[in-house]
């Protein structure tokens, strides 16, 4: 079979959705006439070469936009960035492209996304809202790292 990315929508526990603003992902309260991004995600084909029991390693992109989430250090700080990249190009690579990979863990309806390149750093949004998505090590404090992921079929 041909592997293709799955599509999904994401919101956090405060019912904020991800929207694209000036090539940056931000979390905002859902409103009428707003178009949240649709997430594209696909599991890494080299799962056996990655850490066990940390979650399912996935590439995360924005559906139809050729943009993927990646983690890179700016100075000493791991940061979350959007890069122009075809998610299938990442999927087909001969090795895991760790800067673009996230361990997806599910507990009940909650999902977390941990950077493979920077273990212990998670995709998060500030509790204030209207802020860009970030990477954080601080779980359950000023930042929200739990998201609701709904797959679209």
């Amino acid at each position: 079979k041909i592997d293709t990315p799955q599509r999904g929508s994401i919101q956090d526990i405060n019912h904020r959705v991800w929207v694209l603003q000036d090539q940056t992902l931000i979390a905002v309260p859902r409103k009428d006439r707003m178009s949240p991004v649709t997430i594209a995600l696909i599991s890494c084909r080299h799962v056996e070469t990655l850490e066990k029991d940390r979650g399912n390693p996935i590439y995360l992109g924005l559906n139809g936009l050729n943009l993927c989430l990646m983690c890179a250090k700016v100075g000493d700080q791991p940061t979350l960035q959007l890069k122009e990249k075809d998610i299938m190009d990442l999927y087909n690579q001969p090795e895991p492209v760790k800067s673009f990979l996230f361990y997806h863990s599910q507990s009940g309806r909650n999902s977390t996304f941990e950077s493979v390149a920077f273990p212990g750093w998670f995709i998060a949004v500030s509790s204030e809202g209207g802020c860009p998505l970030i990477l954080t090590q601080e779980l359950g404090k000023a930042n929200t790292t739990d998201f609701g992921l709904t797959m679209l079929f």
Epitope: E48, T49, L50, N92, Q93, E95
Partner: antibody, heavy 121, light 109 residues
Framework: QVQLVQSGAEVKKPGASVKVSCKAS????????IHWVRQAPGQGLEWIGR????????RYDPKFQGRATITTDTSTSTVYLEFSSLRSEDTAVYYC??????????????WGQGTLVTVSS | QAVVTQEPSLTVSPGGTVTLTCRSS?????????ANWVQEKPGQLFAGLIG???DRAPGVPARFSGSLLGGKAALTISGAQPEDEAIYFC?????????FGGGTKLTVL
Amino acid sequence: QVQLVQSGAEVKKPGASVKVSCKASGFNIKDTYIHWVRQAPGQGLEWIGRIDPAIGTTRYDPKFQGRATITTDTSTSTVYLEFSSLRSEDTAVYYCARLHYFGNNFFFDYWGQGTLVTVSS
Amino acid sequence: QAVVTQEPSLTVSPGGTVTLTCRSSSGAVTTSNYANWVQEKPGQLFAGLIGGTNDRAPGVPARFSGSLLGGKAALTISGAQPEDEAIYFCALWFSNHWVFGGGTKLTVL
């Protein structure tokens, strides 16, 4: 600058084992994959296997599975290849190489200077 | 397991163009083989030239280009320089392992 410096030449008897080292500098070894490749006299290159130093997971060419063991010590940025049950046909120069993702693809961009392993009774 | 074959030797005139190829015994080479090309010059370390079939490694001169040609991976040197005299190895990816070719000795004469 990026460098991979390998240990010195070895002479071994058939049936023995050898352990070759590859010390990385100028980059974070955890951000890349380190491969081992060998070249027998007058022959082409032969891929042995690779390690992900950040995690320690390995892959091997089926031909070498069971005889080659690749390990890493991230505290010293060193990768090791241990080769067991040596035969005369294992006489070769053994190279470590970095497979690095840059832009859109992986490249075997930097290589060690090679370690000559001679197997002779 | 696939065998990867290269021309044993080729000669090019300075300023000329030459194409080295890399054939797989298991069929046509495709972009899914992520062809890499590596250069070995006498007395120097191996150096990566091309990855992912046609991407140049950082710092590699534009006269080196990678492509697919008639079901083979190809490395073309346009405007060959004396310093391009070397042995060139290709490597192809097959699902879970790499296979290298036997190398092409290029003479610039």
